[in-house]
């Protein structure tokens, strides 16, 4: 697989390829899940339509020491135009519900699959 921009990548792959690779990684996580993902860590739920990639990264970046989602975190950083650090959470997003990382990944995966089917790569 071509490495995604955001972690020592030589250049961005086409958006359709980038989205497909992110979907494949999320599928990987959900299929290989044996014990509770990231020890059942909780993250903020996000609006999956508004500025979704940065919002997803802001939520997941606060999970540390979970190797299962490290690649997803790196991939999402390539999808976000600004730098995101742990502890940052934009006022543009509502913080009202926390969900398990496993549920977050499933929700994100379902939404990305829908976007891919509809050809919304951007």
């Amino acid at each position: 697989l071509t490495c995604l921009g955001g972690f020592a990548s030589p250049g961005p792959v086409p958006p359709s390829t980038a989205l497909r690779e992110l979907i494949e990684e999320l599928v990987n996580i959900t299929q290989n899940q044996k014990a509770p993902l990231c020890n059942g860590s909780m993250v903020w739920s996000i609006n999956l339509t508004a500025g979704m990639y940065c919002a997803a990264l802001e939520s997941l970046i606060n999970v540390s020491g979970c190797s299962a989602i490290e690649k997803t975190q790196r991939m999402l950083s390539g999808f976000c135009p600004h730098k995101v650090s742990a502890g940052q959470f934009s006022s543009l997003h509502v913080r009202d519900t926390k969900i398990e990382v496993a549920q977050f990944v499933k929700d994100l995966l379902l939404h990305l699959k829908k976007l891919f089917r509809e050809g919304q790569f951007n």
């Epitope: 995604l4 921009g5 955001g6 972690f7 020592a8 990548s9 961005p12 792959v13 958006p15 980038a18 989205l19 339509t49 508004a50 500025g51 979704m52 990639y53 940065c54 950083s77 390539g78 999808f79 135009p81 600004h82 730098k83 995101v84 650090s85 940052q88 934009s90 543009l92 919304q120 790569f121 951007n122």
Partner: antibody, heavy 118, light 109 residues
């Protein structure tokens, strides 16, 4: 006060290599993505690429792959753009810009004029 | 690669409201394009105005606002002033790279 101070104008021969610098003051470059943008006379802006100075991770526009190399030095708070195998097509003004949290490209350098001519 | 299109030139009068738009060649502009608006004044003076569709940069006058109108991103200047005469560039983020529009030359007469 936030400032991006770019290196001076360059006049170089075709085939040469040049390294432009962008020294930041008033903030830490490791806290932001730093971008480079090209502007040719009477043309629009072209995005070259970005760097995360904290870890050196970069992304380039495919058009500039193999042509541009972006690096950063957090100790001197400086971002660099190296351009190789220069041709007349590389004659342009090059800008560095800071990208803020949720945008925009809020602070820009004053630009470095690069002229490639024999 | 996508092409981003802007009006090449617009003219307005002081006090009037003017809207500049930014169209994507590959469909509707959404919040996931993180639309940016940048102002260029003479002598290569660039200033970032709006990020992420409608996020105004600190210090930018409130008369500048960003939005989505129909399938495009838009920059509205409510009550234009003579000092707003400039070239305005929009930029759209396509998953992992930026594409700039050609710029709109705004004249305030």
């Amino acid at each position: 006060e936030v400032q991006l101070q770019q290196s001076g104008a360059e006049f170089v021969r075709p085939g040469a290599l040049v390294k432009l610098s962008c020294k930041a003051s008033g903030f830490n470059i490791k806290d932001y993505y730093m971008y480079w943008v090209k502007q040719r006379p009477e043309q629009g802006l072209e995005w070259i690429g970005r760097i995360d100075p904290e870890n050196g991770n970069t992304i380039y526009d495919p058009k500039f792959q193999g042509k541009a190399s972006i690096t950063g030095d957090t100790s001197s708070n400086t971002a660099y753009l190296q351009l190789s195998s220069l041709t007349s097509e590389d004659t342009a003004v090059y800008y560095c810009a800071r990208y803020a949290y949720y945008g925009p490209f809020d602070y820009w350098g004053q630009g470095t004029t690069l002229t490639v001519s024999s | 690669q996508a092409v981003v299109t802007q009006e090449s030139a617009l003219t307005t009068s002081p006090g009037e409201t003017v809207t500049l738009t930014c169209r994507s060649s590959i469909g509707t502009v959404t919040t996931n394009n993180y639309a940016n608006w940048v102002q260029e004044k003479p002598d290569h003076l660039f200033t970032g105005l709006i990020g992420s569709t409608n996020n105004r940069a600190p210090g930018v006058p409130a008369r500048f606002s960003g939005s989505l109108i129909g399938d495009k991103a838009a920059l509205t200047i409510t009550g234009a002033q003579t000092e707003d005469e400039a070239i305005y560039f929009c930029a759209l983020w396509y998953s992992n790279h930026w594409v700039f529009g050609g710029g709109t030359k705004l004249t305030v007469l």
